[in-house]
Structures are given as structure tokens and as C-alpha cells.
Interface confidence: low
């Protein structure tokens, strides 16, 4: 196979957040982030090769303590396919409860043209520190 | 490509910890740990091939309850490049808050000669159980 | 190498759980789950190729709040090799403490014929939502 498509993205949002959608960025201006294959479109990741991907994410809440997290509960992060609409589905979902960071990963089939969106519901802000909040994919097999 | 460089390490520290740096080991005496490519130097992992790596870690605190964790807050784990100094950077950071385990992973570019260090700040000790505390890397692409 | 063996499984349990063992399933009836190489045997995953694997899991507790989680503590998830008996070992272990989701991953050597089992101890039930509870493996190298 050619080199596996991979991407590692950093948070690139304008605050205060007007909607729950997190916007991502990559490249030298955003730390050690990159896209090799997938592309960014308006802050979302677009897949350019069919296959099974490992999708991973870590999100840390800003200025957060376990008290803050529980007071603002529910704060939930979801990663899903948001377009095309016919393939819309939630792939990964986690709630913060009394913690200030969630991190997870999963294998999932993705198709060329799938766009991945990440939604953070609740009133807390995500950290933009490059070692605390990131989102990425790695092509594993056809 | 030749076989991807991989390593899975177990904790190999002397208690009580005199400094926040965790020291790792691999091999039959330390459970199901190994190094295929990267090497251990004084308990830190040294990279021997340029590329994008998946770095993952899980650390569980010993003799810990949610009460202990919150009383001893902040307890934070950071994974970073510690040498060469010119490339020093924090790659991954998590706090324990009211939990006793953190686990995460990320894709990051690493270069031959980069040494990865893991720092656990705070007064709590990490568990040495091989299924609770481990740290590893997997080469993904050039 | 031929295509890497991979599997991503969804929960396929009968409630109420009579024992702590979680049973998994794959295929169209269970969301975006699949087995490419490994096989399911009575809800457990059987490995069909020797090598180093990335094992990952996320389990979310159903009808859970941080209060529920702490009141029902200890609730612990363990992933291990359960057969053949001679190779029985715990690979990955996490407790829920005051959280309702655990997620982690690790690299580990597995051999053809190894069967992986996942045990959830405690009285709380796992969520069957396909974006909240899943378990998978990915072959990485020989």
C-alpha cells in the first residue's frame, strides 16, 4: 500500500464558542499537527481514502477542577461522521463527569468523502494547549 | 518498509521517587514488555527511526481512591521529548483529578535521537502492576 | 505482509449479567463492528495470527452518574488472555472510581489461539450504545 493516511489536529476555535462544534487545524502554526492524506474543511476532517481507521481524541477542559466539571455536568464529547448526511453517525462518545480530560480511541470503517465532526456540549471551554487537546486518525487497512 | 519500530514498557522505578521522572524497563523480568527498534537509556525511551509515531500511556496511582486523588490534587502526568534540549517539548499531559488512572494516546512526529521522558508530579506513587501502568510507541509512517 | 488482522467489537450481552464476563459481537446487526482475521467464539475474541497487537477498549456504564459510580465502587474492567490456561494473564485493568467511562489501549504480544476475555466486576451494567462501549485489536508487527 502507499503510505497510510494520517492526521493529527490541534484545536483552532474562536471563543466564546457559538455552537458546540469544535474546529481543528494543522500545520506549523499549530504545533506538531499535520495532515497526510485527509484534508481540513472549515475545521473538520475529510477522509480521502476508504478503509478502517484508528480514530483517537483527547480533550481537556479549560480552567477546570472536579468541582467545576460536576457543576457543569453534563459535558459530553462526541465524534461522528457529519457528512454526507446519509452516513451521519456517532462513532465515539464520552462524558466528563468529575474529570477534566477525556481520551479514547476506536477502529472504524471510513469512506472517501466522510467528514468527521467533534461536538462538545455544555458550557465549559476546551483547552487549546497542544499537549492537552488533540484529534487524529490513522489508516490501518482497506 | 522494514518492520515498524515498537516498544511497550513497564514501570521500573525505585520507591520512594526522588524526582518526578518515571523510569521504564522492558524484557522478560517486566511482564509482556519489549523494545523492537527504540532503546532504553537510563529508563527513558530513545527513538532510532524518524517518523510519525503513535505514543500511548496508562498510569494508575497506587493505593488510591477518588478521595486520595482529590486530596493530593494536582497530580499530573506529562510525556515529552526531553532531549536533545533543542527539541524539548511536552507531547501529552493529563491530570488525575478524582480518578486514579489516566490513559491516552496521540500521533506525533519523532526523530532519531529523540528521548521521551514521562513526569508524574505530585506526592502519589504509580502502581507497578503490569496491567495498570505501561507506556509505548508504535511507528506508523515516515 | 498480508492485510493486518483487525477487529472492532460491540457489546452483545444478555442482561441481567449472571457473571462478570462481557460478551462481544460483530457484524451489521451491531453497528460498525467487524472481524478481519480474529474470530468470535462465544462472545470472546480468538487470535489467528502471532504478533504484537494494539488492544483497545472503551466501556461506559449505563444509567450512571459520578455519585452512582462512587457508591458502587469498586467497579473494575480487566482485559486478559483467558485461554489457553497456560497463557492466562491480565493485560489491561482500570477502575471507574467517580467516572462512568474508562478507555485505554496497549501494545501486547498475542499468539494464534489466544482468547481474550473482558471482565466487568461490580453491580453496574455496561451501556450497549455502539459509540460508548467497544473493544478491538489491531495487528502491528510479527
Amino acid at each position: 500500500h502507499p503510505e497510510p493516511h494520517t492526521a493529527e489536529l490541534q484545536l483552532n476555535l474562536t471563543v466564546p464558542r457559538k455552537d458546540p462544534t469544535l474546529r481543528w487545524g494543522a500545520g506549523p502554526a499549530l504545533g506538531r499537527s499535520f495532515t497526510h492524506g485527509p484534508e481540513l474543511e472549515e475545521g473538520h476532517l475529510r477522509i480521502h481514502r476508504d478503509g478502517i481507521y484508528m480514530v483517537h481524541i483527547q480533550v481537556t477542559l479549560a480552567i477546570c477542577s472536579s468541582t467545576t466539571a460536576s457543576r457543569h455536568h453534563p459535558t459530553t464529547l462526541a465524534v461522528g461522521i457529519c457528512s454526507p448526511a446519509s452516513r451521519s453517525i456517532s462513532l465515539l462518545r464520552l462524558s466528563f463527569h468529575q474529570g477534566c480530560t477525556i481520551a479514547s480511541q476506536r477502529l472504524t470503517p471510513l469512506a472517501r468523502g466522510d467528514t468527521l465532526c467533534t461536538n462538545l456540549t455544555g458550557t465549559l471551554l476546551p483547552s487549546r494547549n497542544t499537549d492537552e487537546t488533540f484529534f487524529g486518525v490513522q489508516w490501518v487497512r482497506p | 518498509h522494514p518492520e515498524p519500530h515498537t516498544a511497550e514498557l513497564q514501570l521500573n522505578l525505585t520507591v520512594p521517587r526522588k524526582d518526578p521522572t518515571l523510569r521504564w524497563g522492558a524484557g522478560p523480568a517486566l511482564g509482556r514488555s519489549f523494545t523492537h527498534g527504540p532503546e532504553l537509556e537510563e529508563g527513558h525511551l530513545r527513538i532510532h527511526r524518524d517518523g510519525i509515531y503513535m505514543v500511548h500511556i496508562q498510569v494508575t496511582l497506587a493505593i488510591c481512591s477518588s478521595t486520595t486523588a482529590s486530596r493530593h490534587h494536582p497530580t499530573t502526568l506529562a510525556v515529552g521529548i526531553c532531549s536533545p534540549a533543542s527539541r524539548s517539548i511536552s507531547l501529552l499531559r493529563l491530570s488525575f483529578h478524582q480518578g486514579c488512572t489516566i490513559a491516552s494516546q496521540r500521533l506525533t512526529p519523532l526523530a532519531r535521537g529523540d528521548t521521551l521522558c514521562t513526569n508524574l508530579t505530585g506526592t502519589l506513587l504509580p502502581s507497578r502492576n503490569t496491567d495498570e501502568t505501561f507506556f509505548g510507541v508504535q511507528w506508523v509512517r515516515p | 505482509h498480508p492485510e493486518p488482522h483487525t477487529a472492532e467489537l460491540q457489546l452483545n450481552l444478555t442482561v441481567p449479567r449472571k457473571d462478570p464476563t462481557l460478551r462481544w459481537g460483530a457484524g451489521p446487526a451491531l453497528g460498525r463492528s467487524f472481524t478481519h482475521g480474529p474470530e468470535l467464539e462465544e462472545g470472546h475474541l480468538r487470535i489467528h495470527r502471532d504478533g504484537i497487537y494494539m488492544v483497545h477498549i472503551q466501556v461506559t456504564l449505563a444509567i450512571c452518574s459520578s455519585t452512582t459510580a462512587s457508591r458502587h465502587h469498586p467497579t473494575t474492567l480487566a482485559v486478559g488472555i483467558c485461554s489457553p490456561a497456560s497463557r492466562s494473564i491480565s493485560l489491561l485493568r482500570l477502575s471507574f472510581h467517580q467516572g462512568c467511562t474508562i478507555a485505554s489501549q496497549r501494545l501486547t504480544p498475542l499468539a494464534r489461539g489466544d482468547t481474550l476475555c473482558t471482565n466487568l466486576t461490580g453491580t453496574l451494567l455496561p451501556s450497549r450504545n455502539t459509540d460508548e462501549t467497544f473493544f478491538g485489536v489491531q495487528w502491528v508487527r510479527p
Epitope: P16, L30 | A78, S88 | -
Partner: antibody, heavy 122, light 111 residues
Framework: EVQLVESGGGLVQPGGSLRLSCAAS????????MNWVRQAPGKGLEWVSD????????YYADSVKGRFTISRDNSKNSLYLQMNSLRAEDTAVYYC???????????????WGQGTLVTVSS | QAVVTQEPSLTVSPGGTVTLTCGLK?????????PTWYQQTPGQAPRLLIY???TRHSGVPDRFSGSILGNKAALTITGAQADDEAEYFC??????????FGGGTQLTVLG
């Protein structure tokens, strides 16, 4: 103990340039966002610029955008502010300030240097 | 024109209680503005006192407390001491990525 020591201030003519430095010690510099904050004589504080821990992302107050450039060298534990096209209204004490590192979008400055005075006058 | 407003000066007696406020020229201050308070004595750099509305920075005495009072952020000093005489600046998060500082309140401890 966290220490931030600014240098490079002085008298400069309008339209001139100056480069401020801040030497950091006592903490892991590469983990923290860093900022410049200024205070005109007898006035309040004004946030000027920040830079992320890796040095790749920078932000500026509208009043200095296009004229000032923030940078850092993590291997030297140093922060810099290159100031070009200086104006009389840039006269101030310039403080180097560490972001508290509370995972924040919101700059919270938990450690400050003693400041260096920049005077822009003909 | 200042966006963030503070009382120019206030006076308190030793042992007394004083409340400094921090408002917006237009609109109300909420916890989403992450009010932060700094203390500055003459010739010194500012010192962080309170962040995230009401969280005391490490080493700050508990006589300093933060809150939201009505439509403003507030810093309350109970049992004022002579060395509390200083200028106090509040900072509000209004738009990414900057904070806006108030003009400062000069606190005098009469003694």
C-alpha cells in the same frame, strides 16, 4: 522558584525598533504559554501578545498587530518581543508574564517579571 | 474608552471589609468572563490573587475572596491589613484570545 527577567528596554525614537527578551528559570518553560503585558506610566495594564508552548501560535492585541512579533526559544528558556514602527503610545513598562497553565483559553498570569521600561520619544 | 470599569479609589479601615467591583461598560459580567484579580504595589509587578471568579491563587490569604455580585465581578477583602494598600486590577475574558483589564482601583487602608 519561578523567575522571569526582562531586558532590552530603553529610549527609542518614533518609528524605531527594539527587541525585548525575557529569561525564564525555575519551571519547565516549554509547557507554558507566555505573554507580554504592558503598563503605560500611571495607567492600567494592557495585554499585548501571547505565544503557545511550542511557539507556533501567536496572538496580538489590535493596537500592536502588524508591528510587534512575539517569539520564543525553548532550548534557551527565553521569550522575545520584536517591536517595530514604535509610537509614542507604546511607551510603557513591558512585563513578561507566564500563563498559569490552567488549560486555558483565558490568559491568567501567575508569574510576572519586574518589567523593562520602553520610552518612545524624539 | 475603557470597556472594563472599576472604582478609581476606595478606602477601608484596618480590620474592616471592602468590596471592589469590576463591570462591563455594556452588559453584565458572568462566570463566562472568567474574572481575574491582580494586586500591584508601587514599583512592583502585579500579583495574581483570584482567577475563575472565586479561586484563590496559591499563597493568597483567605481574607481575599471573589464572587459575582449582581451584574459585576467583586473582590472582597475582609479584615483589611495595612499591606493590602495597593492598586487592584480586574481582568475579564471578552473575546479570544485576549483579556481586557480594568483601569484599576487604588485601595487605601486608613491607619
Amino acid at each position: 522558584e519561578v523567575q522571569l527577567v526582562e531586558s532590552g528596554g530603553g529610549l527609542v525614537q518614533p518609528g524605531g525598533s527594539l527587541r525585548l527578551s525575557c529569561a525564564a528559570s525555575g519551571f519547565t518553560f516549554s509547557v507554558y504559554y507566555m505573554n507580554w503585558v504592558r503598563q503605560a506610566p500611571g495607567k492600567g495594564l494592557e495585554w499585548v501578545s501571547d505565544i503557545n508552548n511550542e511557539g507556533g501560535t501567536t496572538y496580538y492585541a489590535d493596537s500592536v498587530k502588524g508591528r510587534f512579533t512575539i517569539s520564543r526559544d525553548n532550548s534557551k528558556n527565553s521569550l522575545y518581543l520584536q517591536m517595530n514602527s514604535l509610537r509614542a503610545e507604546d511607551t510603557a513598562v513591558y512585563y513578561c508574564a507566564r500563563d498559569a497553565g490552567y488549560s486555558n483559553h483565558v490568559p491568567i498570569f501567575d508569574s510576572w517579571g519586574q518589567g523593562t521600561l520602553v520610552t518612545v520619544s524624539s | 474608552q475603557a470597556v472594563v470599569t472599576q472604582e478609581p479609589s476606595l478606602t477601608v479601615s484596618p480590620g474592616g471589609t471592602v468590596t471592589l467591583t469590576c463591570g462591563l461598560k455594556s452588559g453584565s459580567v458572568t462566570s463566562d468572563n472568567f474574572p481575574t484579580w491582580y494586586q500591584q504595589t508601587p514599583g512592583q509587578a502585579p500579583r495574581l490573587l483570584i482567577y475563575n471568579t472565586n479561586t484563590r491563587h496559591s499563597g493568597v490569604p483567605d481574607r481575599f475572596s471573589g464572587s459575582i455580585l449582581g451584574n459585576k465581578a467583586a473582590l472582597t477583602i475582609t479584615g483589611a491589613q495595612a499591606d493590602d494598600e495597593a492598586e487592584y486590577f480586574c481582568a475579564l475574558f471578552i473575546s479570544n484570545p485576549s483579556v481586557e483589564f480594568g483601569g484599576g482601583t487604588q485601595l487605601t487602608v486608613l491607619g
